[in-house]
C-alpha cells in the first residue's frame, strides 16, 4: 500500500517516499523505483540552508558598498552571506539591507552604548554632576571638575552641557 506520510528528511511524491536533498544541494529529479533522488551541488554564489526539494538554489546576498555594506561572513553552499556596515554606519534592519550613519549624542547627552555594525548609538542624558559639551558618537558624560581637590572654589555652577568654573578662594584680610 502506498505511504501517506514519510520519515524525516523525506517527501511524498507519486505515492512514494523520496529523500530530500541535503543542505547545499538542489533537486534535479525525484527518486524512481530504480534510483534515489537526484540532487546536485549549488553553484559558486548560491546556497540552500535546509534539507529541501528546491529545484533552484538561492543566490547569496550581495553586500552593496554603495549602500555602505561590506561582507561580515562569506556565504557557503549551505549558508547565506552575512553583511554588515562600514565603520561609522549601522544596519537599518535585522536583514541589514542598507546602512545609516551612527547617530551622535547632542550636548547634554553622553554615549551609553557605542554603535556597532548592527545597532545605533544609545544616548543618555547627563545626570547631575556630569556634562557633555560636544555632539559625539563616542563621548560619554564627563564628571564636573572637582574644584576642592585643586584647592579652588566653584565660581560658576556646572550644567548638563558645561563644566563648573573653578576660581581661587577669597582670602580674608587680617
Amino acid at each position: 500500500e502506498p505511504p501517506t506520510a514519510c520519515r524525516e528528511k523525506q517527501y511524498l511524491i507519486n505515492s512514494q517516499c523520496c529523500s530530500l536533498c541535503q543542505p547545499g544541494q538542489k533537486l534535479v529529479s525525484d527518486c524512481t523505483e530504480f534510483t534515489e533522488t537526484e540532487c546536485l551541488p549549488c553553484g559558486e554564489s548560491e546556497f540552500l540552508d535546509t534539507w529541501n526539494r528546491e529545484t533552484h538554489c538561492h543566490q547569496h546576498k550581495y553586500c552593496d558598498p554603495n549602500l555602505g555594506l561590506r561582507v561580515q561572513q562569506k556565504g557557503t553552499s549551505e549558508t547565506d552571506t552575512i553583511c554588515t556596515c562600514e565603520e561609522g554606519w549601522h544596519c537599518t534592519s535585522e536583514a541589514c539591507e542598507s546602512c545609516v550613519l551612527h547617530r551622535s549624542c547632542s550636548p547634554g547627552f553622553g554615549v551609553k552604548q557605542i554603535a556597532t555594525g548592527v545597532s545605533d548609538t544609545i544616548c543618555e542624558p547627563c545626570p547631575v554632576g556630569f556634562f557633555s559639551n560636544v555632539s559625539s558618537a563616542f563621548e560619554k558624560c564627563h564628571p564636573w571638575t572637582s574644584c576642592e581637590t585643586k584647592d579652588l572654589v566653584v565660581q560658576q555652577a556646572g550644567t548638563n552641557k558645561t563644566d563648573v568654573v573653578c576660581g581661587p578662594q577669597d582670602r580674608l584680610r587680617a
Partner: antibody, heavy 116, light 111 residues
Framework: QLQLQESGPGLVKPSEILSLTCTVS??????????WGWIRQPPGKGLEWIGN???????YYSPSLKSRVTISVDTSKNQFSLKLNSVTAADTAVYYC????????WGQGTLVTVSS | QSALTQPPSASGSPGQSVTISCTGT?????????VSWYQQHPGKAPKLMIY???KRPSGVPDRFSGSKSGNTASLTVSGLQAEDEADYYC??????????FGGGTKLTVLG
C-alpha cells in the same frame, strides 16, 4: 514507465541549423524530473554532453558548444528541443535526449548526418 | 573542460574481475561525488550502471561496483559474463551545472 523519443531530420546541409525534438511520455516534463539533457555520439567515438534545460527554461551548455547551441522547452507538448547552428561534418552524430543530469533514462537516439 | 581519461580497452576471461579507471581533476571527479558509469552495447543507447560513485540502480547486477580515490574513479565488473562485453563510459559533474564524459573503454570478454 518513462520514455523519451528523439525526432528530426536525419540529413542537414553544412552551415545550416540542426533541429531535434525530444518527446517525453509516461510522465510530465515538469514533474518527476525537472532537468533534461542532450548528449551526442559521433560514429565510432565517445559520448559528448551538449547541455541541459530546466523545465522553466533555464539552460546550461557545454563550453565547447555554447556559442552554437540553443535548448528550449515546451511543457504543453511535453517536449524539449535542440538547435545547433552553423553545422559542419564534425557535427555528424547520434543525438540522444535523456533525463536529469544522471541520465537514468535515454531516448533510443537519432543519427544526424551533415552533408551537402 | 577536457574529457575524462579512460583506457581505450580492457579485457578479462569469464568469471574474472576487470577494473576500468576514469581520471579527471579536482574540478570534476575529485571535487564531487557525482561520477556515473554507463554501459553501451553496439547500436543501443547507453544504460546507467552506477551513479554517485558507487550506487547501483535497482536491476543492475551487484557484479558491477564503483569507487573513487582522489581524482580517479573506477568501475569493477566481477564474475565477468559474455553479455558484459560492451563500451563503458564514465561521466562526472564538473560544477556550475556542467558535465563531462570519459572517452570510453571497450571491454572484451575473452574466450
Amino acid at each position: 514507465q518513462l520514455q523519451l523519443q528523439e525526432s528530426g531530420p536525419g540529413l542537414v546541409k553544412p552551415s545550416e541549423i540542426l533541429s531535434l525534438t525530444c518527446t517525453v511520455s509516461g510522465g510530465s516534463i515538469s514533474s518527476s524530473s525537472y532537468y533534461w539533457g542532450w548528449i551526442r555520439q559521433p560514429p565510432g567515438k565517445g559520448l559528448e554532453w551538449i547541455g541541459n534545460i530546466y523545465y522553466r527554461g533555464d539552460t546550461y551548455y557545454s563550453p565547447s558548444l555554447k556559442s552554437r547551441v540553443t535548448i528550449s522547452v515546451d511543457t504543453s507538448k511535453n517536449q524539449f528541443s535542440l538547435k545547433l547552428n552553423s553545422v559542419t561534418a564534425a557535427d555528424t552524430a547520434v543525438y540522444y535526449c535523456a533525463k536529469g543530469f544522471r541520465f537514468d533514462y535515454w531516448g533510443q537516439g537519432t543519427l544526424v548526418t551533415v552533408s551537402s | 573542460q577536457s574529457a575524462l581519461t579512460q583506457p581505450p580497452s580492457a579485457s578479462g576471461s569469464p568469471g574474472q574481475s576487470v577494473t576500468i579507471s576514469c581520471t579527471g581533476t579536482s574540478s570534476d571527479v575529485g571535487g564531487y561525488n557525482y561520477v556515473s558509469w554507463y554501459q553501451q552495447h553496439p547500436g543501443k543507447a547507453p544504460k546507467l550502471m552506477i551513479y554517485e560513485v558507487s550506487k547501483r540502480p535497482s536491476g543492475v547486477p551487484d557484479r558491477f561496483s564503483g569507487s573513487k580515490s582522489g581524482n580517479t574513479a573506477s568501475l569493477t565488473v566481477s564474475g565477468l559474463q559474455a553479455e558484459d562485453e560492451a563500451d563503458y563510459y564514465c561521466s562526472s559533474y564538473a560544477g556550475s551545472n556542467n558535465l563531462v564524459f570519459g572517452g570510453g573503454t571497450k571491454l572484451t570478454v575473452l574466450g
